[in-house]
């Protein structure tokens, strides 16, 4: 397969990854699909340095990341281990709050206005960040 050696147009390169910052909102699943159709994934934050980079670009706006617990435990969309990985939750979060009246709890994580994380209803139309790694071999399926 081919390798991606530079970032696509309108994407920002940082530490061997490419990032795309939306300027409109979508529900978490629709944002996830958008990134996947760009051969990318919702951003996976693995360090304080990456957290600051993303925070700088999104500003004080609720923004989806690639972290959810829709199937039970918290999981990063790219398989990065949640338990041992970087975390930046707001105090007393995640709380899986049911009091919003929208049905169910809160299963999707987002950056809040101060950059720290909160869990929220996945249907909320927040902005999002896509990420893809440079030099990642294409996963083109074989033609039948």
């Amino acid at each position: 397969g081919s390798e991606r050696t530079c970032c696509p147009v309108n994407w920002v390169e940082h530490e061997r990854s490419c990032y795309w910052f939306s300027r409109s909102g979508k529900a978490w699943a629709d944002a996830d699909n958008y990134c996947r159709l760009e051969d990318a994934h919702l951003v996976v934050v693995t360090s304080w340095e990456e957290q600051k980079f993303v925070q700088h670009h999104i500003g004080p706006v609720n923004t989806w990341m690639g972290l959810h617990d829709q199937n039970g435990p918290w999981k990063w969309v790219d398989g990065t281990d949640y338990e041992t990985g970087f975390k930046n939750w707001r105090p007393e979060q995640p709380d899986d709050w049911y009091g919003h009246g929208l049905g169910g709890g809160e299963d999707c994580a987002h950056f809040t206005d101060d950059g720290r994380w909160n869990d929220d209803v996945c249907q909320r139309p927040y902005r999002w960040v896509c990420e893809t790694e440079l030099d990642k071999a294409s996963q083109e399926p074989p033609l039948l």
């Epitope: 081919s2 996947r36 760009e38 051969d39 139309p125 996963q139």
Partner: antibody, heavy 120, light 107 residues
């Protein structure tokens, strides 16, 4: 100049198969998601399937899921749609469409279309 | 699935007229909307994306507005080449869906 040229349409019996192709030129093919959209005679437009630029992700309309397969060969700048278990309601003009510059979801270029007729 | 409803289904107009078409989504799609023009025997052509952004090369007499569930496409000063069918499309959520179209006919 961006060009998309579909081929492979024709008359097929119900239950049969057909493979559509779309030859692309005039842009960096592997950088763009592509879709198939169909239009039934005298009717509106229906999105059928989409595939990411490097082929790693595909999406389908429920009406074709499990029967149709979208794929691409970036070395040949070609998009494909393998259509199996065809039904009369699949009769339509099939267009390949390129996703817009700098982001997916809107189609900024379309091919001329290829007619698929499913009839006994 | 998100349903897209266009009105009217057809409109009769004259060259020079200002015409407005409406597209309504069954749920909030914010600005994830495009407008296409299609003439008989040809493929659709993108006119407007992101609800109000004019596609490169499209004449400025075409304009789009709206957000949420209600959108409009306006042609200010209809030209002979504008007699066609116009479709809206939502790109908020899969499956992407189109309206049934508005046909503009010569009065």
């Amino acid at each position: 100049e961006v060009q998309l040229l579909e081929s492979g349409g024709g008359l097929v019996q119900p239950g049969g198969s057909l493979r559509l192709s779309c030859a692309a030129s005039g842009f960096t093919f592997s950088s763009y998601a592509m879709s198939w959209v169909r239009q039934t005679p005298g009717q509106g437009l229906e999105w059928v399937s989409a595939i990411s630029g490097r082929g790693g992700t595909t999406f389908y309309a429920d009406s074709v899921k499990g029967r149709f397969t979208i794929s691409r060969d970036n070395s040949k700048n070609t998009l494909y749609l393998q259509m199996n278990s065809l039904r009369a309601e699949d009769t339509a003009v099939y267009y390949c469409a390129k996703d817009g510059y700098g982001g997916n979801s809107f189609f900024d270029y379309w091919g001329q279309g290829t007619l698929v007729t499913v009839s006994s | 699935d998100i349903q897209m409803t266009q009105s009217p289904s057809s409109v009769s107009a004259s060259v020079g007229d200002r015409v407005t078409f409406t597209c309504r989504a069954s749920q909030d799609i914010f600005d994830w909307l495009a407008w296409y023009q299609q003439k008989p025997g040809t493929a659709p052509k993108l006119l407007i994306y992101a609800a109000s952004s004019l596609q490169s090369g499209v004449p400025s007499r075409f304009s789009g507005s709206g957000s949420g569930t209600n959108f409009t496409l306006t042609v200010s000063g209809l030209q002979p080449e504008d007699f066609a069918t116009y479709y809206c499309q939502q790109a908020y959520s899969f499956p992407w869906t189109f309206g049934q179209g508005t046909k503009v006919e010569i009065k």
